[in-house]
Interface confidence: medium
C-alpha cells in the first residue's frame, strides 16, 4: 500500500460568543484538512478526532465518524468544527478577548487532529499538531494558511 497523506491546512473560521456572567468565551473553530489517497484503490476516512489546547489545557474536543470515501489517487478537503470553551481558571482571558481598545485579540491554540482511515479491513492512524492564531475577540474567516503561528506576530508599524 502507498501512503495516505494528511495535511492540516489551517483554521477556516472562528465564531465567538460570550457569557458575561460566567466570564466565559465560546469559540467554534472550523479547521480544514486535505487528505490524499496515493493508492490505486479507495480508502474510507472512518473518523477524525480533534482537540484544541490553550496554554497546555484542553479546551475542546470533537469526533466525526464515517466521513467519506476517497477514490484512487484522489484528494478530498474536509472541514471539521471543534467547539471550545475558555472558562474557569482561564476566565482572565475574557478580559483580553473583550477589550475593545485593541482590534486583534489573537491567542495561540494548539490544534491536534488524528485521522483514522481503513482499506481492506486494515486501519491506519495519522496525527498532526499545529499551532494556530485565532482571534477570540470577533467572528473571523481566514484565508487558508493565514492563521498559522510561525513566530510572534509583529504589529503594524
Amino acid at each position: 500500500p502507498r501512503s495516505i497523506d494528511v495535511k492540516y491546512i489551517g483554521v477556516k473560521s472562528a465564531y465567538v460568543s460570550y457569557d458575561v456572567q460566567k466570564r466565559t468565551i465560546y469559540l467554534n473553530i472550523t479547521n480544514t484538512l486535505n487528505i490524499t489517497n496515493n493508492n490505486y484503490y479507495s480508502v474510507e476516512v472512518e473518523n477524525i478526532t480533534a482537540q484544541v489546547q490553550f496554554s497546555k489545557t484542553v479546551i475542546g474536543k470533537a469526533r466525526l465518524n464515517n466521513i467519506t470515501i476517497i477514490g484512487p489517487l484522489d484528494m478530498k478537503q474536509i472541514d471539521y468544527t471543534v467547539p471550545t470553551v475558555i472558562a474557569e481558571e482561564m476566565s482572565y482571558m475574557y478580559d483580553f478577548c473583550t477589550l475593545i481598545s485593541i482590534k486583534v485579540h489573537n491567542i495561540v491554540l494548539m490544534m491536534q487532529v488524528t485521522v483514522t482511515t481503513t482499506y481492506f479491513g486494515h486501519s491506519e492512524q495519522i496525527s498532526q499538531e499545529r499551532y494556530q492564531y485565532v482571534d477570540c475577540g470577533r467572528n473571523t474567516t481566514y484565508q487558508l494558511g493565514q492563521s498559522e503561528y510561525l513566530n510572534v506576530l509583529q504589529p503594524q508599524q
Epitope: 482572565y92 478580559d95 477589550l99 481598545s101 482590534k103 486583534v104 489573537n106 506576530l153 503594524q156 508599524q157
Partner: antibody, heavy 123, light 112 residues
Framework: QVQLQQPGAELVKPGTSVKLSCKAS????????MHWVMQRPGQGLEWIGN????????HYNQKFKDRAKLTVDKSSSTAYMQLSGLTSEDSAVYYC????????????????WGQGTSVTVSS | DIVMTQAAPSVPVTPGESVSISCRSS???????????LFWFIQRPGQSPHLLIY???NLASGVPDRFSGSGSGTAFTLRISRVEAEDVGVYYC?????????FGSGTKLEIK
C-alpha cells in the same frame, strides 16, 4: 505632520442627508481608527461611532445607528460620515479624530482631531 | 452605557494657582490589564478638542507637565498647577473601556 482636513460648513435642508468628509495625511491611514464626534452649539461632546479603514469594521453609538453610516476610501485616505433624516437637532459641529488600531492598545488615542464641519439644518 | 459625570460646570481660578477638575464614572474604568481607560481633553474657545491625558495619568505628547491625572477606577481628577491664561477652556473626561464611548458634560475653567 498629521492632519485631518474637514470642510468648514454645510447647509442642508430638513429631511435630507449630508455626507461629511475627513481627509487624513501624514500617517498610514489604515493604521488608525477614525472616530466621529458631534457637538451641538454650546453643548458637550457626543461620540457617534468609529471605523477601522483597514477592513471597514464599524462601531456605532446606538443613538445614531439607524441614521449614521461610516465609510472610508482608502485610495484617497478619506473617511466619510453620512447622516440621514436630518432635523434641526442635527445642527452641530462634527469632528473626526483618529486613534491607533490593529494590534496596539489605544495608547495616545484620539490624539489628532479635525477642525470640524459645522452643519446647519434649515429650510 | 457608562455615564460620565462632571459635577462642576465651571471652576474659577487665579493665574499661578492650582486647580483640580473632577470626573466620575458609573462603572470602574480599570481593566484587569492594569490600564484605566480614561482620557482628559481640553477644548479651547473656538477650537477642536485636544488630548491632554490618556489612560488616566499619562501625559499626551507636547502637553506641559503642569497637567497631571490621577484617580481610582471610578473617581478621577485632572490637576493643573500654576494655571496660565492659555489653560482657559472646557475640560472633558471620556471613557473608552466600553462602546459607546462617553464624555462627561465638561467643566469650564475660568480665570478670576
Amino acid at each position: 505632520q498629521v492632519q485631518l482636513q474637514q470642510p468648514g460648513a454645510e447647509l442642508v435642508k430638513p429631511g435630507t442627508s449630508v455626507k461629511l468628509s475627513c481627509k487624513a495625511s501624514g500617517s498610514t491611514f489604515t493604521n488608525y481608527w477614525m472616530h466621529w464626534v458631534m457637538q451641538r452649539p454650546g453643548q458637550g461632546l457626543e461620540w457617534i461611532g468609529n471605523i477601522d479603514p483597514s477592513d471597514s469594521d464599524t462601531h456605532y453609538n446606538q443613538k445614531f445607528k439607524d441614521r449614521a453610516k461610516l465609510t472610508v476610501d482608502k485610495s484617497s485616505s478619506t473617511a466619510y460620515m453620512q447622516l440621514s433624516g436630518l432635523t434641526s437637532e442635527d445642527s452641530a459641529v462634527y469632528y473626526c479624530a483618529r486613534s491607533r488600531g490593529g494590534y496596539y492598545d489605544y495608547g495616545e488615542a484620539m490624539d489628532y482631531w479635525g477642525q470640524g464641519t459645522s452643519v446647519t439644518v434649515s429650510s | 452605557d457608562i455615564v460620565m459625570t462632571q459635577a462642576a460646570p465651571s471652576v474659577p481660578v487665579t493665574p499661578g494657582e492650582s486647580v483640580s477638575i473632577s470626573c466620575r464614572s458609573s462603572k470602574s474604568l480599570l481593566h484587569t490589564n492594569g490600564n484605566t481607560y480614561l482620557f482628559w481633553f481640553i477644548q479651547r474657545p473656538g477650537q477642536s478638542p485636544h488630548l491632554l491625558i490618556y489612560r488616566k495619568s499619562n501625559l499626551a505628547s507636547g502637553v506641559p507637565d503642569r497637567f497631571s491625572g490621577s484617580g481610582s477606577g471610578t473617581a478621577f481628577t485632572l490637576r493643573i498647577s500654576r494655571v496660565e491664561a492659555e489653560d482657559v477652556g472646557v475640560y472633558y473626561c471620556m471613557q473608552h473601556l466600553e462602546y459607546p464611548f462617553t464624555f462627561g458634560s465638561g467643566t469650564k475653567l475660568e480665570i478670576k
